[in-house]
C-alpha cells in the first residue's frame, strides 16, 4: 500500500493510473467503501463523502489513463485509506495528514518557551526533528519545547516529520521579542550630553506597551525611577519624569532617551522595562553611564572615574606625545605638582581607548584652563 | 562543541558479533537522531540504520534487518550499534552521524571491525 | 530503495577551476538531498543539504542546485583543500542511500 503524507491546510494528489491511455470509467472510495467522486463520460460525479466540497480531479489528465483525487484544504481528519477502482482493479493509497503548531502566540519573549505541538492521525507514531534559524535541533514526539528563547532563534524554523519512512517538512516563522542589546555602556566626559538608545530586535505593525527606566546612582543607596512612558502604535508619550536628571524621551521608535549633562551623580546603571500588550513578561535592556572628569586643584592633577566600570581597566595620567606619568587599575590618579602642558585623562581597555579627557596645566602663577 | 567518540577498533571472527558505542557530548544528546553508516575498504557510503534517541524507535535498512540492532542509553549520551552473523564482507569502518532528517551533521572517528578468520 | 547515481566517477581538475558534480535519484526525492566531502582515513564532512542549504562553516565557494531527480554540487574555484572524494545522499525516505561517490584529483 502507498503511503502519502500531506500537511494540514495544504492540497495533496492521489495518483491513480489505468493500464490504457484513454479515459476510462474509475472512482475513488474510502475505507468504509463511501464513494468520494468518479467519472460519467467525461464528467466528474462527487459522492456523499465528507470531503465533497473539497475533492476535485484533473480532467485534462483523464484521457491519458491517469485519474487523480485531489484534496484541498486538508484536516487531520482526512487521514485515511483511498481507494481508487479502475479496469477492475483497486490502487489504495494510505493518506496521512499532519499539522504542527506553535501552542502560543509565534511572538514570544526573550527567555520564554517555545512549544510545538504535532497533530497526528490516530495509530500514527511519527519522529520530529527542528531546527532552529542558528542550527540547534531538537527532537520529540507529539510536542517539542526549547526553554530559554534566544535572539538568534528568531526566524524560520524548520520541522521534518517522519511516518513510514517518508517524510514531511513545516516552517514556523518565529519573532522573539527582545532589544537589540541586553546591556549597553556610555562613556561620557563631565557636561557632555548623553544619549541612551534602546533598538527592539524586530519589527511589528502595530506595537503598544508601556516602559519604565529605573536607575542606581553609584552614589546612591536606593534606585530610583527615572522615567515612564507608554508606547502606542510606534508613537511614544512621557508620563512621568523625574525633575533631576532632566530627561528627555524621543517620540518615536527606537526608544531614545536625552540627558542633557552627565554628572558624576548621575554615573550608575539603569535598566529599562518594556511591558508590551498581551504579553506576560517584560523586555530588559541594561544601560551603564560612566563619567570622567579632571581638576586641578593648587599642586594636585587628579582624574577621576565614575559609574560601572570593570577591574580590568586602567586609567591613566599623561603629559600630551609622552609617557603615561601614572597608570593604574583604579578609578583616581593624580599627579603632584604636574608640569605645564596639556595633560590627558585616559580611560581604556587592553590598549583601546574609551574615554579621554583633556586638561592644560599652565606654569604655576597661572590658574588652569579646561578646553 | 559537537563531537562523536567511538570505541576503538575490533577483529571478530565470522559468525560472531560486534557492538560498536558512540559517546556524544557538546548538545543534549535526545536533541538529534543517530544513525550509523558503513563503509567498506575502498568502497562508498552505507546507510545501515536510525535511532530517535527521544523515543527509542528504531529503523533499519533491509539488508541489515534481522542482524543489527541500534540502541541507546540517555544516562550516557550513548549510542550503541551491534552486527551480529558477522562475515568477510562485514568488515568495514562504521561511523556513527548525527541525524536530523535533513543530513548527517557531526560524524564520529569512524571504528574499523574487521571480520577474519 | 532509491538508487543515486553520481557522475562523473573521478575528475581532474586545477587550483582556480570551476567544478560541477552531479547526482542522480532513480525517483524524485523532492530537495531531500545532502552533498558530503570525504579525504581519506578521515570521516564525511556535511557540505549542503537540502539540495542548496549551505551548511554553517562551509566556505562559501561550495553551491548546491536542482531538486525532483537531479541535482548538482559546484565549487566555484577550487582550493588545494578540496581535492577529495564527494558524495550526495538522499534523505526523502529511508532507506537512506549514497551516490557511489566522485573522486576530485589534481590535474
Known amino acids: 500500500k502507498k503511503v502519502v503524507l500531506g500537511k494540514k491546510g495544504d492540497t495533496v494528489e492521489l495518483t491513480c493510473t489505468a493500464s490504457q491511455k484513454k479515459s476510462i470509467q474509475f472512482h475513488w472510495k474510502n475505507s468504509n467503501q463511501i464513494k468520494i467522486l468518479g467519472n460519467q463520460g467525461s464528467f466528474l460525479t462527487k459522492g456523499p463523502s465528507k470531503l465533497n466540497d473539497r475533492a476535485d480531479s484533473r480532467r485534462s489528465l483523464w484521457d491519458q489513463g491517469n485519474f487523480p483525487l485531489i484534496i484541498k484544504n486538508l484536516k487531520i481528519e482526512d487521514s485515511d485509506t483511498y481507494i481508487c477502482e479502475v479496469e477492475d482493479q483497486k490502487e489504495e493509497v494510505q493518506l496521512l495528514v499532519f499539522g504542527l503548531t506553535a501552542n502560543s502566540d509565534t511572538h514570544l519573549l526573550q527567555g520564554q518557551s517555545l512549544t510545538l505541538t504535532l497533530e497526528s492521525p490516530p495509530g500514527s507514531s511519527p519522529s520530529v526533528q527542528c531546527r532552529s534559524p542558528r542550527g540547534k535541533n531538537i527532537q520529540g514526539g507529539k510536542t517539542l519545547s526549547v526553554s530559554q528563547l534566544e535572539l538568534q532563534d528568531s526566524g524560520t524554523w524548520t520541522c521534518t516529520v517522519l511516518q513510514n519512512q517518508k517524510k514531511v517538512e513545516f516552517k514556523i516563522d518565529i519573532v522573539v521579542l527582545a532589544f537589540q542589546k541586553a546591556s549597553s555602556i556610555v562613556y561620557k566626559k563631565e557636561g557632555e550630553q548623553v544619549e541612551f538608545s534602546f533598538p527592539l530586535a524586530f519589527t511589528v505593525e502595530k506595537l503598544t506597551g508601556s516602559g519604565e527606566l529605573w536607575w542606581q546612582a553609584e552614589r546612591a543607596s536606593s534606585s530610583k525611577s527615572w522615567i515612564t512612558f507608554d508606547l502606542k502604535n510606534k508613537e511614544v508619550s512621557v508620563k512621568r519624569v523625574t525633575q533631576d536628571p532632566k530627561l528627555q524621551m524621543g517620540k518615536k521608535l527606537p526608544l531614545h532617551l536625552t540627558l542633557p549633562q552627565a554628572l558624576p551623580q548621575y554615573a550608575g546603571s539603569g535598566n529599562l522595562t518594556l511591558a508590551l500588550e498581551a504579553k506576560t513578561g517584560k523586555l530588559h535592556q541594561e544601560v551603564n553611564l560612566v563619567v570622567m572628569r579632571a581638576t586641578q586643584l593648587q599642586k594636585n592633577l587628579t582624574c577621576e572615574v565614575w559609574g560601572p566600570t570593570s577591574p580590568k581597566l586602567m586609567l591613566s595620567l599623561k603629559l600630551e606625545n609622552k609617557e603615561a606619568k601614572v597608570s593604574k587599575r583604579e578609578k583616581a590618579v593624580w599627579v603632584l605638582n604636574p608640569e605645564a602642558g596639556m595633560w590627558q585623562c585616559l580611560l581604556s581597555d587592553s590598549g583601546q581607548v574609551l574615554l579621554e579627557s583633556n586638561i592644560k596645566v599652565l606654569p604655576t602663577w597661572s590658574t588652569p584652563v579646561q578646553p | 562543541q559537537v563531537q562523536l567518540v567511538q570505541s576503538g577498533a575490533e577483529v571478530k571472527k565470522p559468525g560472531s558479533s560486534v557492538k560498536v558505542s558512540c559517546k556524544a557530548s557538546g548538545y543534549t544528546f535526545t536533541s538529534y537522531g543517530i544513525s550509523w553508516v558503513r563503509q567498506a575498504p575502498g568502497q562508498g557510503l552505507e546507510w545501515m540504520g536510525w535511532?530517535?534517541?527521544?523515543?527509542?524507535?528504531?529503523d533499519y535498512a533491509h539488508k541489515f534487518q534481522g542482524r543489527v540492532t541500534i540502541t541507546a542509553d540517555e544516562s550516557t549520551s550513548t549510542a550503541y550499534m551491534e552486527l551480529s552473523s558477522l562475515r568477510s564482507e562485514d568488515t568495514a569502518v562504521y561511523y556513527c552521524?548525527?541525524?536530523?532528517?535533513?543530513?548527517?551533521?557531526?560524524w564520529g572517528q569512524g571504528t574499523l571491525v574487521t571480520v577474519s578468520s | 530503495d532509491i538508487q543515486m547515481t553520481q557522475s562523473p566517477s573521478s575528475l581532474s581538475a586545477s587550483v582556480g577551476d570551476r567544478v560541477t558534480i552531479t547526482c542522480r535519484a532513480s525517483e524524485s526525492v523532492s530537495t531531500w538531498l545532502a552533498w558530503y566531502q570525504q579525504k581519506p582515513g578521515k570521516a564525511p564532512k556535511l557540505l549542503i543539504y537540502?539540495?542548496?542549504r549551505l551548511e554553517s562553516g562551509v566556505p562559501s565557494r561550495f553551491s548546491g542546485s536542482g531538486s525532483g531527480t537531479d541535482f548538482t554540487l559546484t565549487i566555484s574555484s577550487l582550493q588545494p583543500e578540496d581535492f577529495a572524494t564527494y558524495y550526495c545522499q538522499q534523505s526523502y525516505k529511508t532507506p537512506y542511500t549514497f551516490g557511489q561517490g566522485t573522486k576530485l584529483e589534481i590535474k
Open positions: 552521524t548525527t541525524d536530523d532528517f535533513l543530513s548527517f551533521g557531526y
Open positions: 535511532i530517535n534517541t527521544y523515543s527509542g524507535y528504531t
Open positions: 537540502k539540495a542548496s
